[in-house]
């Protein structure tokens, strides 16, 4: 057992059918030592009495709020929730596996520059009696400081039957620079609560590797006189870090016929305008890439040739 | 990356090109690795990122753009003269690098030489025969000392008497390897910014 | 104590469908995940499916993906294994499991797929 | 397909020391623990070992189990008649958890 915050304490049990548990004893929180009570939660059954109470912890019935009473007095209150070890390995029961980019991947994050400034979400199916806390460091034997604001649902989604929600949170790395060559990982850990079962989930990258920038800005197209070629032009993103010249990106350039069973001409290039040809009907598209090393693509900016 | 590119002529900056060659080849190096030693471990999550410069040469600090000079996190071990000697940069305007930005980037890559092809000989006795590293990648790093032009002085190959432990030798290799990458992108930035200025 | 006593094997032809059943006693049955295991004649044990305490999520083993349901019920306190388009190979004694680091097995039922 | 790789088998004399080997790879037993079950002829599985050493009750002390990187061993010391069975190690990988991946089984003879 261990105290997850004031008042709150996790139990970690090995999670199988008729499983022995494991005891816990509870202090009352008083400088009382007599004619004190127990309770569970909005029971008024009496568990037991005296300044301490022993119970056998098995089972999500046998979580929950205790509370220490003195003549209809509340003295302290200590919240049991329960860890699930299931066959060795800690239950991922209120999270869902985002299988990207590989399976197991609970916590997802992003990056738009160099700047140690981050995003992680997660998705889940709950709706209700959830809670999460975030924290970071770089590096785990001595932690440099992350500072992470609080996780907020950002966005809810219809899969099939069930509703989906998506919830994110911001961190920023206390004293990042830009140029540095990370050698310790930024560490992710989420503790998630769902009514009376407590869970954790980590994550852990190089900023250089999360990295996705914005889609290029300004996307303009000038059409080239007496020719179907056009001068596409754009700029890179805002959030991208700068100096442009340090921290270069390339580009791709797609030309994609209104149907998506057309070929699509690809370019690539490190300038920040290339010529191709517009089809009718036709759209063309841009995204960008850390030039020197290849994390992830930025979403597409896109203009039609018309 | 693999993708078709139309790069731009590097123009009056020779390291430019050198430098795009190294990190193309030591990319390549490294998934290769990844691939041939798939039993072992030699991606990034598994490996110990170890930096054979550390304490010895100061890239990142020295070759640091201005722009940066402001932002406190990176001003840790600045040295603050500005360099004079140096073929890469021919006639082109210098003020705007630290003193020991290229001088740095040579020792890099003397150092890196030096551990690759100590690291060679040793995987030229394995029976396994498993692992070789790539003369491209080797020669990519001599080319670009040669554009350097520095002189400094040549560090002895390191020989050993004992029988080489293969296995840890190849997860040395992807250890180097990674962090060669992670310099070999610094130093392409740098020469990008030089050749900009 | 924990029990769990399995039912609907038998002998089927090749293509046709066969559910399996295993009914558990003696615990919280809808807080536990629960396996499919099965073992061919004179070979080894290969896992089939598992599904988690509250039937929300279902994982397969490649050689049934498709072709095999796993389900429970937890008010009856029962676990199924819908079996289609049955092949020749899937002959064998199929075990219902509990998860966990202690586990609890069926007896076993044949499922025999012959023409 | 069988990830973990046992002898198909092994045999000894009653009082002997009989060892299998279980060996697999980083994802599986260098990244989760190992079980061991003994399988009589016509029985369901039986559960000896779990979490790589730990003896569930009831399970006789002459059997050890242990892990080391990507190996896992099961030892039986002072074999008995009573113990010829077939062995199978189990592990999971951690890709595809919570599928089960067993080992490919090791029949235990005990010899005179």
């Known amino acids: 057992i261990w105290e997850l915050k004031k008042d709150v304490y996790v139990v970690e049990l090995d999670w199988y059918p008729d499983a022995p548990g494991e005891m816990v004893v509870l202090t009352c929180d008083t400088p009382e030592e007599d004619g004190i009570t127990w309770t569970l939660d909005q029971s008024s059954e009496v568990l037991g009495s005296g300044k301490t109470l022993t119970i056998q912890v098995k089972e999500f019935g046998d979580a929950g709020q205790y509370t220490c009473h003195k003549g209809g007095e509340v003295l302290s209150h200590s919240l049991l929730l329960l860890h699930k070890k299931e066959d060795g390995i800690w239950s991922t029961d209120i999270l869902k596996d985002q299988k990207e980019p590989k399976n197991k991947t609970f916590l997802r994050c992003e990056a738009k520059n160099y700047s140690g400034r981050f995003t992680c979400w997660w998705l889940t199916t709950i709706s209700t009696d959830l809670t999460f806390s975030v924290k970071s460091s770089r590096g785990s034997s001595d932690p440099q400081g992350v500072t992470c604001g609080a996780a907020t649902l950002s966005a809810e989604r219809v899969r099939g039957d069930n509703k989906e929600y998506e919830y994110s949170v911001e961190c920023q790395e206390d004293s990042a620079c830009p140029a540095a060559e990370e050698s310790l990982p930024i560490e992710v850990m989420v503790d998630a609560v769902h009514k009376l079962k407590y869970e954790n989930y980590t994550s852990s990258f190089f900023i250089r590797d999360i990295i996705k920038p914005d889609p290029p800005k300004n996307l303009q197209l000038k059409p080239l006189k007496n020719s179907r070629q056009v001068e596409v032009s754009w700029e890179y993103p805002d959030t991208w870090s700068t100096p442009h010249s340090y921290f270069s990106l390339t580009f791709c350039v797609q030309v994609q016929g209104k149907s998506k069973r057309e070929k699509k001409d690809r370019v690539f290039t490190d300038k920040t305008s290339a010529t191709v040809i517009c089809r009718k009907n036709a759209s063309i598209s841009v995204r960008a890439q850390d030039r020197y090393y290849s994390s992830s693509w930025s979403e597409w900016a896109s203009v039609p040739c018309s | 990356r693999n993708l078709p590119v139309a790069t731009p002529d590097p123009g009056m900056f020779p390291c430019l090109h050198h430098s795009q060659n190294l990190l193309r080849a030591v990319s390549n190096m490294l998934q290769k690795a990844r691939q041939t030693l798939e039993f072992y471990p030699c991606t990034s999550e598994e490996i110990d990122h170890e930096d054979i410069t550390k304490d010895k040469t100061s890239t990142v600090e020295a070759c640091l753009p201005l722009e940066l000079t402001k932002n406190e996190s990176c001003l840790n071990s600045r040295e603050t003269s500005f360099i004079t000697n140096g073929s890469c940069l021919a006639s082109r305007k210098t003020s705007f690098m630290m003193a020991l930005c290229l001088s740095s980037i040579y020792e890099d890559l003397k150092m890196y030489q030096v551990e690759f092809k100590t690291m060679n000989a040793k995987l030229l006795m394995d029976p396994k025969r498993q692992i070789f590293l790539d003369q491209n990648m080797l020669a990519v790093i001599d080319e670009l000392m040669q554009a350097l032009n520095f002189n400094s002085e040549t560090v002895p190959q390191k020989s050993s008497l004992e029988e080489p432990d293969f296995y840890k030798t190849k997860i040395k290799l992807c250890i180097l390897l990674h962090a060669f990458r992670i310099r070999a992108v610094t130093i392409d930035r740098v020469m990008s910014y030089l050749n900009a200025s | 104590q924990v029990q769990l006593v399995q039912s609907g094997g038998g002998v089927v032809q090749p293509g046709r469908s066969l559910r399996l059943s295993c009914a558990a006693s003696?615990?919280?049955?809808?807080?536990?995940?629960m396996h499919w295991v099965r073992q061919a004649p004179g070979k080894g044990l290969e896992w089939v499916a598992f599904?988690?305490?509250?039937?929300?999520?279902?994982y397969y083993a490649d050689s049934v993906k498709g072709r095999f349901t796993i389900s429970r019920d937890n008010s009856k306190n029962t676990l199924y294994l819908q079996m289609k388009s049955l092949r020749a190979e899937d002959t064998a004694v199929y075990y219902c499991k509990t998860h966990g680091s202690h586990d609890n097995w069926g007896q076993g039922t044949m499922v025999t797929v012959s023409s | 397909s069988y990830v973990l790789t046992q002898p198909p088998s092994v045999s000894g004399t009653p009082g002997q020391r009989v060892t299998i080997s279980c060996s697999g790879g980083?994802?599986?037993?260098?990244?989760?623990?190992v079980k061991w079950y003994q399988q009589l002829p016509g029985t369901a599985p039986k559960l000896l070992i779990y979490e790589n050493d730990q003896r569930p009750s009831g399970v006789p002390d002459r059997f050890s189990g242990s892990k080391s990187g990507t190996s896992a061993s099961l030892a039986i010391t002072g074999v008995q008649a009573e113990d010829e069975a077939d062995y199978y190690c189990q592990s999971y990988d951690r890709g595809t958890h919570p599928a089960l991946l067993f080992g490919t089984g090791t029949k235990v003879t005990v010899l005179g």
């Open positions: 980083r994802s599986n037993i260098g990244s989760n623990t």
């Open positions: 003696g615990f919280t049955f809808s807080s536990y995940g």
């Open positions: 599904i988690r305490y509250d039937g929300s999520n279902k």
